[in-house]
């Protein structure tokens, strides 16, 4: 039967080394066996490159394309093929479709004055444009109470958040995760980092009386 694309490719770039495109076929498809995504930078002399997609679900395909350190002017021509049949053709400008890398190494440390210090790493090297552009969202949730969660926006440069222990329930186990976005690039949010868990052993002042 004929091969058709149900949802055309949607692509995002981490703006350093990789662009990822995802699309949905109209029926379950062995993406790596049946499809190829070709991509070529719109730049004099550029070669055509081929990405072999993988299955994310039965009919969802995903392709990870290694790209050079992106610059604003870069535009790629994309062509989705099923053998000799061109299923879809489009262009993709990485600088206009940024999804930052996931922040790493989230840790929680007890700090002075009954505070917790949450720290994570900026996923970009200092020389990359995005290094100084990231802001973060930290989600802190009670492992045993879905209603007890807080969201913190970290808009300053350092990848840290100080959290007063008194704002959390004493004796409860909490998990935190962090994600990033780049405002000047109008990016989407990165994926959430893996969670880190700790016990909030802060003793309310009233219990001392």
């Amino acid at each position: 039967g004929s091969v058709k694309v149900l949802h055309e490719p949607s692509c995002f770039s981490d703006y350093i080394s990789t662009s990822v495109c995802q699309w949905k076929m109209d029926h379950p498809t062995n993406c790596s066996a049946e499809l190829r995504l070709s991509y070529q930078l719109d730049f004099m002399g550029s070669e055509n490159h081929t990405c072999v997609p993988e299955n994310r679900e039965d009919s969802v395909c995903v392709c990870s394309m290694p790209i050079d350190d992106a610059v604003e002017a870069d535009v790629y021509q994309l062509d989705l093929w099923a053998g000799q049949q061109l299923l879809w053709s489009g262009s993709f400008q990485p600088s206009k479709h940024v999804k930052p890398r996931t922040p790493g190494n989230l840790t929680v440390h007890p700090n002075i004055s009954h505070t917790w210090l949450l720290m994570w790493t900026n996923p970009y090297p200092t020389e990359n444009h995005l290094h100084s552009e990231l802001t973060y969202m930290v989600n802190v949730s009670n492992d045993n109470d879905p209603e007890d969660f807080k969201v913190y926006n970290v808009t300053y440069m350092g990848p840290t958040l100080r959290l007063a222990a008194s704002t959390l329930k004493s004796g409860a186990s909490y998990s935190a995760r962090v994600r990033a976005w780049a405002q000047t690039y109008n990016s989407t949010w990165s994926d959430w980092s893996p969670s880190t868990t700790w016990l909030n052993y802060y003793e309310p002042w009233e219990q001392h009386l």
Epitope: L41, F43, M44, G45, S46, E47, N48, H49, P66, I67, D68, V71, E72, A73, D74
Partner: antibody, heavy 125, light 112 residues
């Protein structure tokens, strides 16, 4: 040592055809785009055509489009320029030159970093 | 198409002096920060052209540091300091950004 040697230049009548060759050595030929540039007697340099490393993409000056064809044989480290429907104004020394490295996603640019010695094409009746 | 305009078309300089050649493009040659696709070439009498400067300011291999390129966008300059008799020839700028590639008309440098 990186070297380019052109051949094939000759005296040809208007409307005639000629094929120029450029044999490369001393570098990984398939990794680089190649360019032809010409120079009419007593005139400046004029770009003619470019082909990327794989041979999959070609570019031409308007003055030669539809008449000239650039190609390459990476197994033989050789660049070609097939010239048809030649005109008097095509009379020039034709140089081949090594252009950008196209093996990477975004071509790495070093300018036209090596040139051949040139071959003379004369179109006259 | 991008048009390249060089000035002056001829230049006469005494040995040891500095020669400056200007090149202007009809469109910006800046692709990304630090990447101006503008080259300079020298063609000595009876020889093939040779690369001097690429990407606006990077010296080609083996080119003496007396040769320097500067500029960005549409305005570029080649400077040759401490000019020597061996520097005589025709200097060309070329844009390598987009097809069709294009050269300036050339500047003939004569050493007095």
């Amino acid at each position: 040592e990186v070297q380019l040697v052109e051949s094939g230049g000759d005296l040809v009548k208007p409307g005639g055809s000629l094929r120029l060759s450029c044999v490369a050595s001393g570098f990984t030929f398939r990794d680089y785009a190649m360019t032809w540039v010409r120079q009419a007697p007593g005139k400046g340099l004029q770009w003619v055509s470019l082909i990327n490393g794989s041979g999959g993409k070609t570019y031409y000056a308007d003055a030669v489009k539809g008449r000239f064809t650039i190609s390459r044989d990476n197994a033989k480290n050789t660049l070609y320029l097939q010239m048809n429907s030649l005109r008097a104004e095509d009379t020039a020394v034709y140089y081949c030159a090594v252009d950008r490295k196209t093996k990477t996603i975004r071509p790495q640019y070093y300018g036209l970093w090596v040139w051949g010695q040139g071959t003379l094409v004369t179109v006259s009746s | 198409d991008i048009v390249m305009t060089q000035t002056p078309l001829s230049l006469s300089v005494s040995p040891g002096e500095t020669a400056s050649i200007s090149c202007r493009s009809s469109q910006s040659l800046l692709y990304s920060i630090g990447y101006n696709y503008l080259d300079w070439y020298l063609q000595k009498p009876g020889q093939s052209p040779q690369g001097l400067i690429y990407l606006g300011s990077k010296r080609a291999s083996g080119v003496p540091d007396r040769f320097s390129g500067s500029g960005s966008g549409t305005d570029f300059t080649l400077r040759i300091s401490r000019v020597e008799a061996n520097d005589t020839g025709v200097y060309y700028c070329m844009q390598g950004l987009q097809s069709p590639l294009s050269f300036g008309q050339g500047t003939k440098l004569e050493i007095k």
